[in-house]
């Protein structure tokens, strides 16, 4: 289990259509469920709910993005559609590059993503919690366009990775 | 700024059409759905339907089948709504709303164009 | 289609007061359930998804509960700015349907 460093540059616009970024880094683990290499997209903030197969279409959006889900205490949610792992699947057959999940009230979600998985995801899949997981929590809940970077070796210079 | 910047009022005859549009700003226009709903003078919301900017494909409530065309347009990151045959019942604040990913709770709504139907 | 039935349909309260209101679905619709808050001649502004998830910004007086076809939208202690219409909504399946509104007013 690698550690995932990830990136986070929150999009401040002013009224003048001019904008100001903010990078925060935080660390999290690259799953087994996933591949353990590098992917960048904007976050799109998802809740566990959103990946069931309920809906009456197809879902689908673009590709590239980063679905970052908030997983709930396992007493909210006692029959999941769907396992962690399938929520990650959907996520990625749905466009997403890479999905962060926030296992911060359901720690067990960690060992139901690296039980080791015949045929892995071919995108990370990282799970992040305690004080990373808040500071990512905080930057997405923010409703303000951020993009993330996931990488396996600690980045340099943010400056390096982001062309604004 | 997030933000959906719907066009203005709009006084029309029974039987003609009213073409609403709906722009959006400070996300990525082709990941979240866009939705309509309305609301008659002094009644609750009304879904009327939805579209999936990505693809286009639209899925309507069926009261509006038939009557009822949204499209969207990528390059200016703007959606329309355009309702035909237009009754004294149609007159209503017409919302555009956007819906969270996967589901189909409404994060970001427009402000509201006020469509008066009267002969 | 399912019909999302709230209750009451209007309430009279006082500043401080514990308001609960209620809305119940024609068919289990697990936890897609959504709450808004409308102003007069306002848009409707999201409070509560997911049956029990406060969306960002909304303070945290609000909370929602329920699952399958009951579920209660709960202000614990009523500020000036609450007074409004409540409405629920079931993100289930299409069509997408509301409650038919809880006006609450200053006692």
């Known amino acids: 289990k690698e550690t995932a460093f990830v990136e986070v540059v929150l999009f401040e616009s002013s009224p003048s259509g001019d904008y100001t970024t903010y990078t925060t880094g935080l660390t999290g683990r690259f799953s087994r469920a996933g591949a353990t290499l590098s992917a960048e997209g904007e976050i799109v903030q998802m809740h566990p709910l959103g990946l069931c197969n309920n809906n009456d279409e197809e879902d689908l959006y673009e590709y590239g993005w980063v679905g970052v889900v908030k997983l709930e205490q396992p007493e909210l949610d006692p029959k999941p559609c769907l396992t962690v792992l399938g929520k990650a699947k959907r996520a990625v057959q749905r466009g997403a590059t890479a999905v962060i999940f926030d296992v911060s009230e359901n720690p067990e979600a960690i060992d139901q993503l690296n039980q080791g998985s015949e045929d892995p995801l071919k995108r990370p899949v990282v799970y992040v919690k305690g004080a990373d997981a808040i500071k990512l929590m905080n930057i997405v809940n923010k409703q303000k366009v951020a993009r993330a970077r996931i990488q396996h070796r600690p980045p340099r210079q943010p400056t390096e990775y982001f062309d604004m | 700024q997030v933000q959906l910047v719907q066009s203005g009022a709009e006084v029309k005859k029974p039987g003609a059409s009213v073409k609403v549009s709906c722009k959006a700003s400070?996300?990525?226009?082709?990941?979240?759905?866009m939705h309509w709903v309305r609301q008659a003078p002094g009644q609750g919301l009304e879904w009327m339907g939805k579209?999936?900017?990505?693809?286009?494909?639209?899925s309507y409530a069926q009261k509006f089948q038939g009557r009822v065309t949204m499209t969207r347009d990528t390059s200016t990151s703007t959606v329309y709504m355009e309702l035909s045959s237009l009754r004294s019942e149609d007159t209503a604040v017409y919302y555009c709303a956007r819906s969270g990913a996967g589901m189909w709770y409404f994060d970001l709504w427009g402000r509201g164009t006020l469509v008066t139907v009267s002969s | 289609d399912i019909q999302m039935t709230q209750s009451p349909s209007s309430l009279s309260a006082s500043v401080g007061d514990r308001v609960t209101i209620t809305c119940r679905a024609s068919?289990?619709?697990?936890?897609?359930l959504n709450w808004y808050q409308q102003k007069p001649g306002k848009a409707p502004k999201l409070l509560i998804f997911?049956?029990?998830s406060l969306h960002s910004g909304v303070p945290s007086r609000f909370s929602g509960s329920g699952s399958g076809t009951d579920f209660t939208l709960t202000i614990s202690s009523l500020q000036p700015e609450d007074f409004a219409t409540y409405y629920c909504?079931?993100?289930?399946?299409?069509?997408?349907?509301f409650g038919q509104g809880t006006k609450v007013e200053i006692k």
């Open positions: 579209i999936n900017p990505s693809s286009g494909s639209t």
């Open positions: 909504q079931q993100s289930y399946t299409t069509p997408i349907t």
């Open positions: 997911a049956a029990s």
């Open positions: 400070g996300y990525t226009f082709t990941n979240y759905k």
């Open positions: 068919q289990d619709i697990y936890r897609y």
